[in-house]
Amino acid sequence: ESGYAQNGDLEDAELDDYSFSCYSQLEVNGSQHSLTCAFEDPDVNITNLEFEICGALVEVKCLNFRKLQEIYFIETKKFLLIGKSNICVKVGEKSLTCKKIDLTTIVKPEAPFDLSVVYREGANDFVVTFNTSHLQKKYVKVLMHDVAYRQEKDENKWTHVNLSSTKLTLLQRKLQPAAMYEIKVRSIPDHYFKGFWSEWSPSYYFRTPEINNSSGEMDPI
């Protein structure tokens, strides 16, 4: 009976949509790389489903993912980073769907951090600085950053600035006086590697001075 049940499960499984997406993070933990995959349909029953990557690996032909709630995850040094790997969704030994992917084309950088804003009274501007772990990496060193800021009362009116450095100057006259602003930053690979935007950094909140205010450095909130 269990044999019939398993066959039935498999037949049902073949009717489902097992579309999935993945992103890689290179040198995310020392020299270790990671690969994260998830189903695009959140309602997929993942009980018996596994992910496997084969090809373009060092010292092994295939690796199995670990399941962490709704996501599937590998952390390893064994990505060759040359050529395409075959990533498959499997039930037992049967592959339900596969994708051939070059892991260097699905890179998601780590989120920037240490975002801060300093007001320069003499220059009448704001210096935005942040940090990224990618400055120390061997592979994904060159990033494009997207700094987004908005007046706190304007729910969806974000202003975006793209830059390749980790420092940005905002002119005081471009901002509203005596207003509270929220600012955040994210990154995407910009040289050789391809992929996706990182998560946003934690937001930083700052208040612009009154028009004739001479307070010097602004206070973060």
Epitope: G55, L57, V58, E59, V60, K61, L80, L81, I82, G83, K84, K100, D102, T104, T105, Y139, Y192, F193
Partner: antibody, heavy 117, light 110 residues
């Protein structure tokens, strides 16, 4: 139809230089890892070098490291091998090969490099 | 670095079956996929087996590949030999970012 056409081979004196080219067509070149493999007269295949789809990753056999440079121009669908400080033992037919989903499913016809005084 | 060792030559009659071995000197044969190439005289190499036992389209099913962990070797088997199979055959494996070729085996169809 996939085509790889090597050129640039010829006779060169020891210590001299040559630049080999490989013109690719019939596939998505900028999605493919590319290799150079050589074969000395009457001998077996010897891997020389590879370059990733983007040009970032380049690797070389110990026998050519520091003398040969692999590069690519994705806009021109072309692969190159700059060979400096050539030696007699570099005499061989040089093939470019497309890795695709598995190494060597497509090879060029080869270009002969002869190093002799 | 490891080496891949093949017999220098093998010969067999048309219609028969021949097996060419490829033995890895150190490290496991299972650690990366094996490919096999056929090179006819005066021609470029072509892939006959990839990923240990997979045949590219257009390669007849007379060609098969296998791995034997106990002998740390790979094998290419050609059944129903034809005169057109006369060629040099090379095995290949990745070694990190390098490719390692076997020395080649000359197959003569008598």
């Amino acid at each position: 139809e996939v085509q790889l056409v090597e050129s640039g081979g010829g006779l060169v004196k020891p210590g001299g230089s040559l630049r080999l080219s490989c013109a690719a067509s019939g596939f998505t070149f900028d999605d493919s890892v590319m290799h150079w493999v050589r074969q000395a007269p009457g001998k077996g295949l010897e891997w020389v070098s590879l370059v990733g789809w983007d040009g970032f990753f380049t690797y070389y056999a110990d026998s050519v490291k520091g003398r040969f440079t692999i590069s690519r121009d994705n806009a021109k669908n072309s692969l190159y091998l700059q060979m400096n400080s050539l030696r007699a033992e570099d005499t061989a037919v040089y093939y470019c090969a497309r890795q695709g989903d598995y190494m060597g499913n497509n090879w060029g016809q080869g270009t002969l490099v002869t190093v002799s005084s | 670095n490891f080496m891949l060792t093949q017999p220098h030559s093998v010969s067999e009659s048309p219609g028969k079956t021949v097996t060419i071995s490829c033995t890895r000197s150190s490290g496991s044969i299972d650690s990366s996929y094996v490919q096999w190439y056929q090179q006819r005289p005066g021609s470029s190499p072509t892939t006959v087996i990839y990923e240990d036992d997979q045949r590219p389209s257009g390669v007849p099913d007379r060609f098969s590949g296998s791995i034997d962990s106990s002998s740390n070797s790979a094998s290419l088997t050609i059944s129903g030999l034809k005169t057109e199979d006369e060629a040099d055959y090379y095995c290949m494996q990745y070694d990190f970012h390098h490719l390692v070729f076997g020395g080649g085996t000359k197959l003569t169809v008598l």
